[in-house]
C-alpha cells in the first residue's frame, strides 16, 4: 500500500514527456602528468566508502590518499588513468558511482579520433643509419589497461621509429586482427601509429598487441581493453540537492533537483501538509500534496520556485523522480524567518557529475 495519503487526486497519466533528460555517462576527470587530482565520492549516507580502480581494490599509498569521501592522487602519471568507482556500503544496500580518470597530455581512448599531435611520432631517419624499430614516445604507451564504457571510441597508439621505416600490424588475443573480426571493422592510421575502434561492445574486450618491425628487428606492446557495459537504472539524484533553504516572510526561494536518468523521468515536488488540523490520515500515513510535476503545463520541473512565502510554507519539500525502472527521492527543509532575520543558504550546492551504474 502507498506510504502516504494524497490530499487531492494527483493522477498524472498519461503525461507529456519533459523536454529533456540526460543519458548518464561517467564523469571524466582529466589531469596532466605531475598534477594532483582530488575527487569527491558523490554518494549520500555512506557508512563505509570503498574505492576501486579498473575493478581492483584501491588502498592508500605514498601517492594515493583516501580521506572520508575524498580520493587524492598526488603527482599523477598516465598509469593512474582508468575507471574508478566508489562504493557506499549501507546497512541494507550499497550504491556505486563510477568516474574516469585520464592522465595525459596527448590523445587517448575515447578522445576525438582526429589526431593533431601525431605527426611528430613519424620519425624520419638518415638513410645511412640503419636501425631496428624503437619506441619514440613511451609516455603515450604507459596506460596498458583501458576500461571504456560501451559505445565509446578507443584508440591504441604505438609511436615508433626505425630505419628503414618499420611497418605496424595488430593482433587481438595473440592472433591476427582482421577487419571482419568486429562489426564496423577498425581503422589503422599508420602515420600516427594508431588503431581506432569506434562504438566498442563487450565482444571487443581483450588484449591488443601492436607489432612494429623492419628487417633489423621487431618490437611489440600489448594493451588490455575492458568494455564496461551500461545497464538501465532508476533515476539518480545529485547528492546534496535539493538543498535546505531559509528566507524571510514575503521572500522568494528556489529548490533544485538535478536528475540523471537513462529513461524519461517523471518529476514530482511534494510537500507534507495538514488536513483538518492533522498531518496524518486515519491510516497513519502522512498527508502529501503534489505541488508541481513534469508534464505538458510544466516549465523546468527540476526547479520548484516559491514566491512571497508565508510561515505556512515552512517544512519539508520532497523531490520524487520516477522512470519505468524505479524511483528516487530526496528532500530539503524550508525555514521561514521573521522579517528582521536575514536568510542564508544552509547547504552548499556541489558540482554536478554524471553517473554510470
Amino acid at each position: 500500500r502507498p506510504s502516504f495519503s494524497l490530499v487531492e487526486d494527483t493522477t498524472l497519466e498519461p503525461e507529456e514527456p519533459p523536454t529533456k533528460y540526460q543519458i548518464s555517462q561517467p564523469e571524466v576527470y582529466v589531469a596532466a602528468p605531475g598534477e594532483s587530482l582530488e575527487v569527491r565520492c558523490l554518494l549520500k549516507d555512506a557508512a563505509v566508502i570503498s574505492w576501486t580502480k579498473d575493478g581492483v581494490h584501491l588502498g592508500p599509498n605514498n601517492r594515493t590518499v583516501l580521506i572520508g569521501e575524498y580520493l587524492q592522487i598526488k603527482g599523477a602519471t598516465p598509469r593512474d588513468s582508468g575507471l574508478y568507482a566508489c562504493t557506499a556500503s549501507r546497512t541494507v544496500d550499497s550504491e556505486t558511482w563510477y568516474f574516469m580518470v585520464n592522465v595525459t597530455d596527448a590523445i587517448s581512448s575515447g578522445d576525438d579520433e582526429d589526431d593533431t599531435d601525431g605527426a611528430e611520432d613519424f620519425v624520419s631517419e638518415n638513410s645511412n643509419n640503419k636501425r631496428a624499430p624503437y619506441w619514440t614516445n613511451t609516455e603515450k604507451m604507459e596506460k596498458r589497461l583501458h576500461a571504456v564504457p560501451a559505445a565509446n571510441t578507443v584508440k591504441f597508439r604505438c609511436p615508433a621509429g626505425g630505419n628503414p621505416m618499420p611497418t605496424m600490424r595488430w593482433l587481438k588475443n595473440g592472433k591476427e586482427f582482421k577487419q571482419e573480426h568486429r562489426i564496423g571493422g577498425y581503422k589503422v592510421r599508420n602515420q600516427h601509429w594508431s588503431l581506432i575502434m569506434e562504438s566498442v561492445v563487450p565482444s571487443d574486450k581483450g588484449n591488443y598487441t601492436c607489432v612494429v618491425e623492419n628487417e633489423y628487428g621487431s618490437i611489440n606492446h600489448t594493451y588490455h581493453l575492458d568494455v564496461v557495459e551500461r545497464s538501465p537504472h532508476r533515476p539518480i539524484l545529485q547528492a546534496g540537492l535539493p538543498a535546505n533553504a531559509s528566507t524571510v516572510v514575503g521572500g522568494d526561494v528556489e529548490f533544485v533537483c538535478k536528475v540523471y536518468s537513462d529513461a524519461q523521468p517523471h518529476i514530482q515536488w511534494i510537500k507534507h501538509v495538514e488536513k483538518n488540523g492533522s498531518k496524518y490520515g486515519p491510516d497513519g500515513l502522512p498527508y502529501l500534496k503534489v505541488l508541481k510535476h513534469s508534464g505538458i503545463n510544466s516549465s523546468n520541473a527540476e526547479v520548484l520556485a516559491l514566491f512571497n512565502v508565508t510561515e505556512a510554507d515552512a517544512g519539508e519539500y520532497i523531490c520524487k523522480v520516477s522512470n519505468y525502472i524505479g524511483q528516487a527521492n530526496q528532500s530539503a527543509w524550508l525555514t521561514v524567518l521573521p522579517k528582521q532575520q536575514a536568510p542564508g543558504r544552509e547547504k552548499e550546492i556541489t558540482a554536478s557529475p554524471d553517473y554510470l551504474e
Epitope: 514527456p17 533528460y21 543519458i23 544496500d93 532508476r234 524519461q264 520516477s322 522512470n323 525502472i325 524511483q327
Partner: antibody
C-alpha cells in the same frame, strides 16, 4: 541470480476475481518497479501496470483502472496482481517483470470460462 | 496513449540474411524504446533498451537505432536460433505500449 517465480495456472468463472503472485529473489526487491504484462492467446503484449514496492506507489493502464489492483509485500519480496470482474477476454498469460524488463516471471495462465 | 506501429507483421528470411524491423511511435519518445525476443511458450527476453544499447549478454548481431518517432531493429546475420517474434516497446510514458510484433521465420 535474479528470479521471478509466479503462482500456478488458474481457471475462473466470469465475474469472479483472480490474484496472481510473483516472488522475487536475487536483487533488492524495493529498488525496482514490478510490472505486470499480459498476453492473450496468439496475441501481442499489453502492459497492465506497475508498483514500486518500497512505498507502494502503483500506476495503471487506464484500460484496467478499477479492475486491476497491484500490491507488494516487502517482507516476502512478493508482488501481486488482482484482476476482478473477469470476462472471457481476460483469458491470457500474465507475466510479472522487474522494473528494467530484463527479468520476467515464467507466466501464469488464467483461463476464464463458464 | 502512445501507439507503436511495428512492421512488417511477419517476414521470412534465410540464414545469414540481414533482417530489419521498424517501429513508429505516434508521439516523440526520444530514445525510450526497447526491443524483445519471444519464443513460443516463453517469456519475452530483453535485447535492446534506450533504442540502441544492447542488454548484457545479447549477441552483437542484434542492434537498434533511431530517435524521436522512428526506430529500427536489425539482425546483421540471421541465425537459426533467432526464429521468434520480436516486439518493440516504448517506456517513455505510461501506459508503456508494445508494437504488434513481428514473426520471423526461416525460408
Amino acid at each position: 541470480q535474479v528470479q521471478l517465480v509466479q503462482s500456478g495456472a488458474e481457471v475462473k468463472k466470469p465475474g469472479s476475481s483472480v490474484k496472481v503472485s510473483c516472488k522475487a529473489s536475487g536483487y533488492i526487491f524495493t529498488s525496482y518497479n514490478v510490472h505486470w504484462v499480459r498476453q492473450a492467446p496468439g496475441q501481442g503484449l499489453e502492459w497492465i501496470g506497475s508498483i514500486y514496492p518500497d512505498n507502494g506507489d502503483s500506476t495503471y493502464n487506464q484500460n484496467y483502472r478499477g479492475r486491476a489492483t497491484i500490491t507488494a509485500d516487502k517482507s516476502t519480496s512478493t508482488a501481486y496482481m488482482e484482476l476482478s470482474s473477469l470476462r472471457s477476454e481476460d483469458t491470457a498469460v500474465y507475466y510479472c517483470a522487474r522494473g528494467d524488463f530484463a527479468y520476467w516471471g515464467q507466466g501464469t495462465l488464467v483461463t476464464v470460462s463458464s | 496513449d502512445i501507439q507503436m506501429t511495428q512492421s512488417p507483421s511477419s517476414l521470412s528470411a534465410s540464414v545469414g540474411d540481414r533482417v530489419t524491423i521498424t517501429c513508429k511511435g505516434s508521439n516523440g519518445i526520444s530514445n525510450d524504446i526497447a526491443w524483445y525476443q519471444q519464443k513460443p511458450g516463453k517469456a519475452p527476453k530483453l535485447l535492446i533498451y534506450s533504442a540502441s544499447y544492447r542488454y548484457s549478454g545479447v549477441p552483437s548481431r542484434f542492434s537498434g537505432s533511431g530517435s524521436g518517432t522512428d526506430f529500427t531493429f536489425t539482425i546483421s546475420s540471421l541465425q537459426p536460433e533467432d526464429i521468434a517474434t520480436y516486439y518493440c516497446q516504448q517506456h517513455s510514458t505510461t501506459p508503456y505500449t508494445f508494437g504488434q510484433g513481428t514473426k520471423l521465420e526461416i525460408k
